[in-house]
Interface confidence: low
């Protein structure tokens, strides 16, 4: 099949990094500067992505692969292939249209991205608040005082902080 395809379509012999130039009798021509083809048999090369403004270049464009961008410090990537950069905030804040704003009382954000979330309601689990919440940290729940018999105090430790960049999006 490959052999047949080659006989029928000379373009199939053009490797990645080249394109099949119809203007030159279907000769395989190298991709022009700032363009690439990541697969063989292409009739055109694609324009390289430009990382500018708040984007910075993570990987330069080559004749066979597109450039890859990430975000300048103080920003994080959003979207497939880092199609967007969103501003980081401090812990205890969330991003709004007008920039970073402190979490309202009763909410917290322990990351540099995402929204402020309500403190856990310990009483829903029949527990009491052992450590009050802050803008940066959730409350710590534990057994209600009535449940604590002498020598048998077991408190729920706070959940380990998630690593930045591993939060659900």
């Amino acid at each position: 099949f490959e052999r047949t395809r080659s006989l029928q379509d000379p373009c199939s012999n053009c490797p990645a990094g080249t394109f099949c130039d119809n203007n030159r009798n279907q000769i395989c021509s190298p991709c022009p500067p700032n363009s690439f083809s990541s697969a063989g048999g292409q009739r055109t090369c694609d324009i390289c992505r430009q990382c500018k403004g708040v984007f910075r270049t993570r990987k330069e464009c080559s004749s066979t692969s597109n450039a890859e961008c990430d975000c300048t410090p103080g920003f994080h990537c959003l979207g497939a292939g880092c199609s967007m950069c969103e501003q980081d905030c401090k812990q205890g804040q969330e991003l709004t249209k007008k920039g970073c704003k402190d979490c309202c009382f009763g909410t917290f954000n322990d990351q540099k991205r995402g929204i402020c979330r309500p403190w856990t309601n310990c009483s829903l689990d029949g527990k009491s608040v052992l450590v009050n919440g802050t803008k940066e940290r959730d409350v710590v729940c534990g057994p209600s005082p009535a449940d604590l018999s002498p020598g048998a105090s077991s408190v729920t430790p706070p959940a380990p902080a998630r690593e930045p960049g591993h939060s659900p999006q």
Epitope: G53, L78, G79, S83, M84, C85, E86, Q87, L95, T96, K97
Partner: nanobody
Framework: QVQLVESGGGLVKPGGSLRLSCAAS????????MSWFRQAPGKGLEWVSH????????DYADSVKGRFTISRDNAKNSLYLQMNSLRAEDTAVYYC???????????????WGQGTLVTVSS
């Protein structure tokens, strides 16, 4: 290919004025919210102002309210920022940005210009 090209930056004395322009191409400009951001030397990016696709909805950061005016000309695919009563703290690279169409009214912008430098100094 989407392109945003800012111009109009330069050196100006405190109290002076400048008008920045952003020429847009490669997308239906009149369909999108647009924003101006700025980045002062050594600082993070700061949102300055936004304008809705029709120009009916406009908002400004507190730091520029009453001094800066955002506008757009959809027929010319252009965004503008008129800056009056400039102060030293307005010194920054100014960027225009196109809002991501999948997330209208959010803080996410999918294309940025290369920026134009505004220096306010006596």
């Amino acid at each position: 290919q989407v392109q945003l090209v800012e111009s109009g930056g330069g050196l100006v004395k405190p109290g002076g004025s400048l008008r920045l322009s952003c020429a847009a191409s490669g997308f239906p400009f009149s369909d999108y919210f647009m924003s101006w951001f700025r980045q002062a030397p050594g600082k993070g990016l700061e949102w300055v102002s936004h304008i809705s696709s029709s120009g009916n909805s406009i908002d400004y950061a507190d730091s520029v309210k009453g001094r800066f005016t955002i506008s757009r000309d959809n027929a010319k695919n252009s965004l503008y920022l008129q800056m009056n009563s400039l102060r030293a703290e307005d010194t920054a690279v100014y960027y225009c940005a196109k809002e991501d169409p999948r997330l209208p009214g959010t803080t996410d912008f999918d294309y940025w210009g290369q920026g134009t430098l505004v220096t306010v100094s006596s």
